[in-house]
């Protein structure tokens, strides 16, 4: 595969990663698929420094990140360990709230208006952030 050495047009480089900030909304799964088709993933926040960077770019707007518990435990989309990793939940969150009346609980994490995290209904059409790492060889499969 080929290595990505610089960010695509309209992406922002920061600490050897590239970030793309949507200005429109999609359900979490559609945002996840969108990022994958860009050879990226929904943003995975691994440090306070990265949290502040993303927060600066998204402003006070609900925005999906690459964290969900749709299959039970909380998981980052790139496999980063959740239990030992960086967290920035709002107080009392995540709460898997069922009182919204939309069916089920809340399985997808997003940045809230103050940057801290909340779990919400995955179908809500929030903005999203894609991330891809520089110097990572693209996984181009061999042709059979």
């Amino acid at each position: 595969g080929s290595e990505r050495t610089c960010c695509p047009v309209n992406w922002v480089e920061h600490e050897r990663s590239c970030y793309w900030f949507s200005r429109s909304g999609k359900a979490w799964a559609d945002a996840d698929n969108y990022c994958r088709l860009e050879d990226a993933h929904l943003v995975v926040v691994t440090s306070w420094e990265e949290q502040k960077f993303v927060q600066h770019h998204i402003g006070p707007v609900n925005t999906w990140m690459g964290l969900h518990d749709q299959n039970g435990p909380w998981k980052w989309v790139d496999g980063t360990d959740y239990e030992t990793g960086f967290k920035n939940w709002r107080p009392e969150q995540p709460d898997d709230w069922y009182g919204h009346g939309l069916g089920g609980g809340e399985d997808c994490a997003h940045f809230t208006d103050d940057g801290r995290w909340n779990d919400d209904v995955c179908q809500r059409p929030y903005r999203w952030v894609c991330e891809t790492e520089l110097d990572k060889a693209s996984q181009e499969p061999p042709l059979l």
Epitope: R23, L37, P125, S138, Q139, E140
Partner: antibody, heavy 121, light 108 residues
Framework: EVQLLESGGGLVQPGGSLRLSCAAS????????MNWVRQAPGKGLEWVSV????????YFADSVKGRFTISRDNSKNTLYLQMNSLRAEDTAVYYC??????????????WGQGTKVTVSS | DIQMTQSPSSLSASVGDRVTITCRAS??????LNWYQQKPGRAPKLLIC???SLQSGVPSRFSGSGSGTDFTLTISSLQPEDFATYYC??????????FGQGTKVEIR
């Protein structure tokens, strides 16, 4: 000039296989996700499959899942669609289409001329 | 999947007429709506993306509007080269993009 040129269509019996190709030129092929869209005779357009620029991510319509495979060779600027276990309802003109995306803008901005696939005994 | 329904399925009009085609989504798609034109024996051509943005080179007599579930393609003054089939397409649901069934614009 940005161009897509499909080939590989033809007549095949039910249960048979066919491999379509799409040769791209005039743009940085590896930077774009590519799609196959089909149109049955006298019918509308149906999205079939998409592959990311690197080839690492693929998706399929339910109607072809498990039977069709999409792939690409970025060194040859070529997109492929391997069609197995073909059925009469797969009869259509198959178009390759370049995806251009930027949030709100998520479109098929360039299309090939199409290649006709007929599944019949 | 999100279903897209166009109306009418066909219409007859004269050169100079104002033509309106509507497209309805089975659920809200915000402004993720594109329009394509297809002439017989040819590949589709992108006309309008994200509801109202005209693709480069598309004449200004074409316009799009709407939001949520209801959308409209308008041709302000129909020209001979506009006789074709028009398709709407939603791009909200990635990647299960779906098209309307098409509207054929014929010469009266």
């Amino acid at each position: 000039e940005v161009q897509l040129l499909e080939s590989g269509g033809g007549l095949v019996q039910p249960g048979g296989s066919l491999r379509l190709s799409c040769a791209a030129s005039g743009f940085t092929f590896s930077s774009y996700a590519m799609n196959w869209v089909r149109q049955a005779p006298g019918k509308g357009l149906e999205w079939v499959s998409v592959i990311s620029g690197s080839g690492g991510t693929t998706y399929f319509a339910d109607s072809v899942k498990g039977r069709f495979t999409i792939s690409r060779d970025n060194s040859k600027n070529t997109l492929y669609l391997q069609m197995n276990s073909l059925r009469a309802e797969d009869t259509a003109v198959y178009y390759c289409a370049k995806r251009n995306s930027s949030g709100w803008h998520d479109v098929f901005d360039i299309w090939g001329q199409g290649t006709k696939v007929t599944v019949s005994s | 999947d999100i279903q897209m329904t166009q109306s009418p399925s066909s219409l007859s009009a004269s050169v100079g007429d104002r033509v309106t085609i509507t497209c309805r989504a089975s659920q809200s798609i915000s402004r993720y709506l594109n329009w394509y034109q297809q002439k017989p024996g040819r590949a589709p051509k992108l006309l309008i993306c994200s509801t109202s943005s005209l693709q480069s080179g598309v004449p200004s007599r074409f316009s799009g509007s709407g939001s949520g579930t209801d959308f409209t393609l308008t041709i302000s003054s129909l020209q001979p080269e506009d006789f074709a089939t028009y398709y709407c397409q939603q791009s909200y649901s990635t990647p299960t993009w779906t098209f309307g069934q098409g509207t054929k614009v014929e010469i009266r």
